[in-house]
């Protein structure tokens, strides 16, 4: 516990209890202490979301969430004379804020968004039932490193879904990551409702496809040798080498984390290389190597996308059938 | 051959500190992770956490964050798993493992015993 | 965080019968960072398969894996007296509780 002593008696309530939106899914709720607080009372602040999650006890007179604003949220706030969760707090007061105005049917739907190769943010999304197909639509933007607001200029369409990407680059500061980039959708007309999305950005990362340099035999053993892409450390991928071999039919899958090119077959010392040595392979046939990345999920919370494959390299024969 | 030795057997009393070391050997330290388990007696593996000795990046299950510290010198190829101060219920076997970016143990310690007692 | 459950906690079967385990994890897992272990009394676990379906170095072919989302199998196509054991299913932070394989 903390605070100074807790009087029997409840608090009164807070005043002034206000809310506001900054950026594009920060809320801010503040409010002023209670008028006619006991004296002796050193104040806290209980409050929690109207669904009675995130339940906090503190000393500050505001209280913020990053959270989209697709849907009605609302805070509850009151006065206790202690850090303790059991002392009855004050009546409760509730400040709620909706979203913007407009015909939920209208707004977009699964907007997605993914951080290609640390590089640039492609976001997608389908177009909402109740929507003319000649809607222009808006994609705004921001993250902490940005003063303000950005508005997407790329807007494309791939089929039923429209898009638009914009460069987000992996800032040195170690933090940048554990922080989450606000996405808004409307059209410029005003008619459909908004659409709101937060992407952490330890989520739905997609490395660049590796690009394979030299494949070459040594006895029985095939050496690749590959590019790693760019922006990522070496504890954060992971590849899937893949070899298929035209006279036995067979595909056979190789995971590879030691990457270092550091055998006598492959070309040394070059920048951002990754080697590996694939065992029994027969060097009278043909062989296809392609390769692939993807994140390690300790350092990127997203597990499930994969790189595209590199393009294909061959080395070996291809034996006439006889 | 990569192999993981771990230091021996400790029995401790309630408050102390321990420090147990786990040494790695037959391939590159720096390029793969060490996770440690915890295994309590007669029950199942627990993921305690993982330390990356290349940069010393760790990370720890919810379970374990701030109950142990996780470090490694890669000068001596070693990682280790401390305690501040000991409980009872930290009496099990340790092992550490050598953990590729895709998450299995592939290779293991033989274990460390760690009896807290009175 | 994602929960492994696995089934059954014990089965009961005869040198050169098949086994089939069964892992279920609490939401779509990529079979990537699935793998399988095997642990015998006073020992350390083995790897046996990452990925979901690689048979680590060393392992013999009568144990595979398969799988994909929530869903995964290990299987031991003809038991040895040496794979009567614990084994247990990994996804990073997440072990399952174990099924052991007992002689009948």
């Known amino acids: 516990g903390g605070g100074g002593a807790a009087p029997t008696e409840t608090q009164p309530p807070v005043t002034n209890l206000s809310v506001s939106v900054e950026n594009l899914c920060t809320v801010i709720w503040t409010w002023n202490p209670p008028e006619g607080a006991s004296s002796n009372c050193s104040l806290w602040y209980f409050s929690h979301f109207g669904d009675k999650q995130d339940k906090k006890i503190a000393p500050e007179t505001r209280r913020s969430i990053e959270v989209p604003l697709n849907e009605r949220i609302c805070l509850q706030v009151g006065s206790q004379c202690s850090t303790n969760e059991s002392e009855k707090p004050s009546i409760l007061v509730e400040k709620c804020i909706s979203p913007p105005e407009g015909d939920p049917e209208s707004a977009v739907t699964e907007l997605q968004c993914i951080w290609h190769n640390l590089s640039y943010m492609k976001c997608s999304w389908l177009p909402g039932r109740n929507t003319s197909p000649d809607t222009n639509y808006t994609l705004y933007y921001w993250h902490r490193s940005l003063e303000k607001i950005h508005q997407c200029e790329n807007i494309f369409r791939e089929g039923q879904y429209f898009g638009c990407s914009f460069d987000l680059t992996k800032v040195k500061d170690s933090s940048f990551e554990q922080h989450s980039v606000q996405i808004m959708v409307k059209d410029n007309a005003g008619k459909i409702k908004p659409s709101f999305n937060i992407v952490p950005l330890t989520s739905r990362v997609k490395p660049d496809p590796p690009h394979i340099k030299n494949l070459s035999f040594h006895n029985d053993d095939l050496y690749v040798q590959w590019e790693n892409p760019q922006n990522f450390i070496s504890r954060c991928l992971f590849y899937e080498v893949e070899v298929n071999n035209s006279q036995t039919e067979t595909h056979n899958v190789f995971y590879v984390q030691e990457a270092k090119c550091e055998n006598p077959e492959f070309e040394r010392n070059v920048e951002n290389t990754s080697c590996f040595m694939v065992p029994g392979v027969l060097p009278d046939t043909l062989n296809t190597v392609r390769i692939r990345v993807k994140t390690n999920k300790l350092c990127y919370e997203d597990d499930k996308l994969w790189s595209n494959w590199s393009q294909e390299m061959s080395i070996g024969k291809k034996r006439n059938s006889t | 051959e990569v192999q993981l030795v771990q230091s021996g057997a400790e029995v401790k009393k309630p408050g102390e500190s321990l420090k147990i070391s786990c040494k790695g050997s037959?391939?590159?330290?720096?390029?793969?992770?060490i996770g440690w388990v915890r295994q309590m007696p007669g029950k199942g593996l627990e993921w305690m956490g993982v330390?990356?000795?290349?940069?010393?990046?760790?990370r720890y299950s919810p379970s374990f964050q701030g109950q142990v510290t996780i470090s490694a010198d890669k000068s001596i190829s070693t990682a280790y798993l401390q305690w501040s101060s000991l409980k009872a219920s930290d009496t099990a076997m340790y092992y550490c493992?050598?953990?590729?970016?895709?998450?299995?143990?592939?290779?293991w310690g033989q274990g460390t015993l760690v009896t807290v007692s009175s | 965080e994602i929960v492994l459950t696995q089934s059954p906690g014990t089965l009961s079967l005869s040198p050169g019968e098949r086994a089939t385990l069964s892992c279920r994890a609490s939401?779509?897992?990529?079979?990537?960072?699935l793998a399988w272990y095997q642990q015998k009394p006073g020992q350390a676990p083995r790897l046996l398969i990452y990925?979901?379906?690689s048979r680590a170095t060393g392992i013999p072919d009568r144990f595979s894996g398969s799988g994909s989302g929530t869903d995964f199998t290990l299987t031991i196509s003809r038991l040895e007296p040496e794979d009567f054991a614990v084994y247990y299913c990994?996804?990073?932070?997440?072990f399952g509780q174990g099924t052991k394989v007992e002689i009948k």
């Open positions: 493992a050598r953990m590729p970016n895709w998450g299995s143990l592939d290779h």
């Open positions: 037959g391939y590159s330290f720096t390029s793969y992770w």
């Open positions: 330390i990356y000795p290349g940069d010393s990046y760790t």
């Open positions: 939401q779509s897992i990529s079979s990537s960072y």
């Open positions: 990925g979901a379906s």
């Open positions: 990994q996804q990073y932070a997440s």
